[in-house]
Interface confidence: medium
């Protein structure tokens, strides 16, 4: 996504020759290169840049379409409800909004990867901030869902159900506020930076090495480790309680939320492991050499693509794992008069049509 201006060494002419003559990808870089300027050439980025140019635009375009359709469907289903949304459904609606906003920025990054950033510094800051706001929001909202379920099932405390309806909204507002705070560096340090020799402009960070490392640590901790720990803790306790109570219906009801969390972990763990390697190289704990740097750059592109795939995955999970979601989607299509559904007046199998399609509360255990 956003190009990071990592603190490159000064490139010497042996390397420029490789870059200009287009054989940099076959240039032999050992694993034990020193940091000195000229005894070993610093790292060319041609391979990772060419990889990004080929791989990212196609991936981002696909994710943009899938994410927009899927999350649009989720939002439509939730907003078509005649009754008030449950706490989990409210969080899921916010999650759909976060994912939609994130995928809306993908076409911009696709253009940036394919050609250059043509949208100016203002949109660079906004798109970068929007991207990170929604990256953090997705993770934190999943943590909120798991905490809500934890209170509900383990402590039999329906924090949002019995309290004022504003409580869940306030929680969501707090999440968005926190994400805005996390995105401040984007507003400050992101800009459309012109590479004079390549005659290309890219949306990238311009800040010192220490700031870059700090931001990555924040992303790793706040956007991944903390939410994942909260989810793991909450669901471990929930499953323990449900197994002890032999609540098979409850376990079935937990299925979707657990699958969503597992999907989050599977999608984002590879990316954050790569970021961790990068942090360790920044801190000098891992030796930085061209071979490793190039592999990290490519791995970052691939794993971040897998991470962004998570935005499109939630709607699919709801569709395939959530029975109620399928039913409500079907009803919505009927109500909209979908041409190929018009003649069929099929009724959903559940009689509790207004119960939550994701909630694992006393009101609806079979909803998934």
């Amino acid at each position: 996504m956003v190009l990071e201006v990592s603190d490159h060494q000064v490139l010497n002419d042996a390397e420029v020759a490789a870059l200009l003559e287009n054989f940099s990808s076959s240039y032999d870089y050992g694993e034990n290169e020193s940091d000195s300027c000229c005894t070993s050439p610093p790292c060319p980025q041609d391979f990772s840049l060419n990889f990004d140019r080929a791989f990212l635009p196609a991936l981002y375009s696909l994710l943009f379409l899938l994410g927009l359709l899927g999350n649009g469907a989720v939002a439509a289903v939730l907003l078509s409800r005649r009754t008030a949304l449950s706490s989990t459904d409210t969080f899921l609606l916010h999650l759909a909004v976060a994912d939609t906003l994130l995928v809306l920025t993908l076409p911009l990054w696709a253009v940036d990867a394919a050609v250059q950033w043509v949208f100016g510094s203002g949109l660079c800051k906004v798109a970068g901030a929007l991207f990170n706001i929604n990256f953090y929001a997705g993770a934190l909202l999943l943590a909120c869902i798991s905490f809500d379920r934890y209170l509900n099932i383990v402590h039999a405390t329906q924090l949002y159900r019995r309290g004022p309806p504003a409580r869940v909204t306030l929680t969501c507002l707090a999440v968005w506020g926190l994400c805005l705070l996390f995105a401040l560096p984007d507003f400050i340090f992101l800009s459309a930076h012109h590479d004079e020799r390549l005659n290309a402009t890219h949306c990238q960070y311009n800040f010192p090495q220490v700031g870059r490392t700090a931001l990555r640590v924040l992303q790793l901790v706040a956007g991944f480790l903390l939410p994942l720990l909260v989810m793991a803790y909450c669901y471990a306790h929930i499953l323990a309680v449900l197994l002890v109570s032999r609540g098979q219906r409850r376990l079935r009801a937990m299925r979707l939320v657990v699958v969503v969390v597992v999907a989050f972990a599977l999608c984002w763990t590879p990316y954050h492991l790569v970021v961790l390697v990068d942090i360790l190289m920044d801190l000098g704990a891992l030796a930085r050499n061209c071979g490793r740097e190039s592999r990290v750059d490519v791995a970052k592109s691939v794993t971040s693509g897998l991470g962004y795939m998570h935005c499109c995955l939630n709607p699919l999970l709801y569709a395939f794992v959530g029975v109620k979601f399928r039913e409500r989607m079907w009803m919505l299509l009927l109500r909209l008069g979908c041409p190929n559904q018009r003649g069929l007046q099929r009724q959903p199998s559940s009689s509790r049509r207004d119960s939550s399609w994701s909630e694992t509360s006393e009101a609806s255990y079979s909803g998934l």
Epitope: A17, L49, D195
Partner: antibody, heavy 123, light 106 residues
Framework: EVQLLESGGGLVQPGGSLRLSCAAS????????MSWVRQAPGKGLEWVAT????????YYPDSVKGRFTISRDNAKNTLYLQMNSLRAEDTAMYYC????????????????WGQGTLVTVSS | DIQLTQSPSFLSASVGDRVTITCRAS?????LYWYQQKPGKAPKLWIY???TLASGVPSRFSGSGSGNEYTLTISSLQPEDFATYYC?????????FGQGTKLEIK
């Protein structure tokens, strides 16, 4: 418009110290590697020190290694050269220069230069 | 260290003349860079990557060469071209400059 303004030069005794500054404006200072290049009176140019844009990597020729230290304050858009154990042969006009970017890396040549600050080492 | 030797060190020429300055490297270099310096002024980047003219440099200037020998050529000397020209290499550390060629009006 790219501008580099050196300051801090002057007369100093052999063995003494001096700190040169270079205030940068007109470009994103944090994105560029920077260098100091000197020119003894009536003589040619000599590269003195280079620092990568984030300050992680620094390079020196053997003639100044261990005596000179290049550093930068990106918050202040300022480049520094701390010169210790000065010798008569360090007498020169000291120029601050910017490295251009190519393919995301920093080149060894210089696309913009300041007007220089004169350092005289004499007893 | 790679030594760069410029020849001639001094060159007297007239407006309209074709002038060639040579820069020889003690061992092969990948590219050569040229700077122009006028008295009391800072050097200016003139040619980079051996033959690419820097922004604002007139097309009468050209650069060529490879390996150990490089040249800067002015096809038709103009009054504003009288200055000192330095070559520089960045193939191996330390970055070194030639001693300079002073171009004077005949």
């Amino acid at each position: 418009e790219v501008q580099l303004l050196e300051s801090g030069g002057g007369l100093v005794q052999p063995g003494g110290s001096l700190r040169l500054s270079c205030a940068a404006s007109g470009f994103t200072f944090t994105s560029y590697a920077m260098s100091w290049v000197r020119q003894a009176p009536g003589k040619g140019l000599e590269w003195v020190a280079t620092i990568s844009h984030g300050g992680t990597y620094t390079y020196y020729p053997d003639s100044v290694k261990g005596r000179f230290t290049i550093s930068r304050d990106n918050a202040k858009n300022t480049l520094y050269l701390q010169m210790n154990s000065l010798r008569a042969e360090d007498t020169a006009m000291y120029y601050c220069a910017r490295h251009p970017i190519y393919s995301g890396n920093y080149q060894g040549y210089f696309d913009y230069w300041g007007q220089g600050t004169l350092v005289t080492v004499s007893s | 260290d790679i030594q760069l030797t410029q020849s001639p060190s001094f060159l007297s020429a007239s407006v309209g003349d074709r002038v060639t300055i040579t820069c020889r490297a003690s061992s092969g270099v990948n590219y050569l860079y040229w700077y122009q310096q006028k008295p009391g002024k800072a050097p200016k980047l003139w040619i980079y990557f051996t033959s690419t003219l820097a922004s604002g440099v007139p097309s009468r200037f050209s650069g060529s060469g490879s390996g150990n020998e490089y040249t800067l050529t002015i096809s038709s000397l103009q009054p504003e071209d009288f200055a000192t020209y330095y070559c520089q290499q960045f193939t191996s550390s330390p970055y070194t400059f030639g001693q300079g060629t002073k171009l004077e009006i005949k």
